[in-house]
Interface confidence: medium
């Protein structure tokens, strides 16, 4: 009883060796075919014929311009990629028989998707924006919003954004704030000069005025008569048949010459102006 | 409008010069990167320069560098490409172009022939 399955395993194993089972898988770098396990072929090389009980697999390099890069049983090699100039591209790297060409974009141009089947020109930042990570083969120009404090007023792929003038350093004054897309407008400090110089004008000139009043009224005599010095300005007056003459200017002068001395009241002054009017 | 108007164009020997001009009007032709691009017959449109703005920033062509030089004149408006050492490869008609995220605007071009 013991002897028959030791008698099945024998017959079992000749008549395995007679017929062998059909394999239901190959190993690596094998592709199964015809109930039979043949040899791929190898990166570089196309498949010519299957392999038979009496012949190994048949491979044929691939021709120029043609590529696998893999262990397999490829009738047809690939071509190489053509990096087409019309595109905006140019060959990084040559391909060989078991390697495709890469392709890069032209300097100024970047990679449409990681394949680099096209290339599209660098965008240029707007005004407004600045260049804060300039393009490269395979990535777009990153633009930034220009911060408070730096501007940039041009459409640029290479731009930076600038700082805005500083006024001070120029011993200037702002006149017009700047933004992100305008400089700062720096102009010379004659308002705030104008705000404490008129009134030191003011007071020195009414100071004056005072000491003026006060040696006349020390100088004059009770007999005086008032007409007098009310008449001695005429004699500076302009006639008006001058060509050209323009009495508006003396008294002008007068002024921002501080020396209002010859019109103490400004009488005539002000009859001028009317004359010529 | 906007116009841009290329000239300068010509025959030119292999090892020869030539300086092509650009003048541009109806745009703010100070705020813009410029660019040259270049046609070789039956090729397709090649980028040959660009600069910035305001000029301080140049780019070339690997094919071109060391030989052409680019530059602007924003008071005149216009755009300049000094093109040294020319070679046969270099014959195309060259057009000047406004650009920002595509070229938006064109020059109808001027004939670079170089030849002996």
């Known amino acids: 009883m013991v002897r028959l399955p030791l008698q099945c395993v024998l017959w079992g194993c000749l008549l395995t060796a007679v017929h062998p089972e059909p394999p239901t898988a190959c190993r690596e770098k094998q592709y199964l075919i015809n109930s039979q396990c043949c040899s791929l072929c190898q990166p570089g090389q196309k498949l010519v014929s299957d392999c038979t009980e009496f012949t190994e697999t048949e491979c044929l390099p691939c021709g120029e311009s043609e590529f696998l890069d893999t262990w397999n049983r490829e009738t047809h090699c690939h071509q190489h990629k053509y990096c087409d100039p019309n595109l905006g591209l140019r060959v990084q790297q040559k391909g060989t028989s078991e390697t495709d060409t890469i392709c890069t974009c032209e300097e100024g141009w970047h990679c449409t998707s990681e394949a680099c089947e096209s290339c599209v020109l660098h965008r240029s930042c707007s005004p407004g924006f600045g260049v804060k990570q300039i393009a490269t083969g395979v990535s777009d120009t990153i633009c930034e919003p220009c911060p408070v404090g730096f501007f940039s007023n041009v459409s640029s792929a290479f731009e930076k954004c600038h700082p805005w003038t500083s006024c001070e350093t120029k011993d200037l004054v702002v006149q017009q704030a700047g933004t992100n897309k305008t400089d700062v407008v720096c102009g010379p400090q004659d308002r705030l000069r104008a705000l404490v110089v008129i009134p030191i004008i003011f007071g020195i000139l009414f100071a004056i005025l005072l000491v003026l009043v006060f040696i006349k009224k020390v100088a004059k005599k009770p007999t005086n008569k008032a007409p007098h010095p009310k008449q001695e300005p005429q004699e500076i007056n302009f006639p008006d048949d001058l060509p050209g003459s323009n009495t508006a200017a003396p008294v002008q002068e007068t002024l921002h010459g501080c020396q209002p001395v010859t019109q103490e009241d400004g009488k005539e002054s002000r009859i001028s102006v009317q004359e010529r009017q | 409008e906007m116009q841009l108007l290329e000239s300068g164009g010509g025959l030119v020997q292999p090892g020869g010069s030539l300086r092509l001009s650009c003048a541009a009007s109806?745009?703010?032709?100070?705020?813009?990167?410029m660019y040259w691009v270049r046609q070789a017959p039956g090729k397709g449109l090649e980028w040959v320069s660009k600069?910035?703005?305001?000029?301080?920033?140049?780019y070339y062509a690997d094919s071109v560098k060391g030989r052409f030089t680019i530059s602007r004149d924003n008071s005149k408006n216009t755009l300049y490409l000094q093109m040294n050492s020319l070679r046969a490869e270099d014959t195309a008609v060259y057009y000047c172009?406004?650009?920002?995220?595509?070229?938006?605007?064109w020059g109808q071009g001027t004939l670079v022939t170089v030849s002996s």
């Open positions: 109806g745009f703010t032709f100070a705020t813009y990167d």
């Open positions: 600069i910035s703005p305001n000029g301080w920033s140049t």
């Open positions: 172009a406004k650009y920002q995220t595509h070229f938006d605007y």
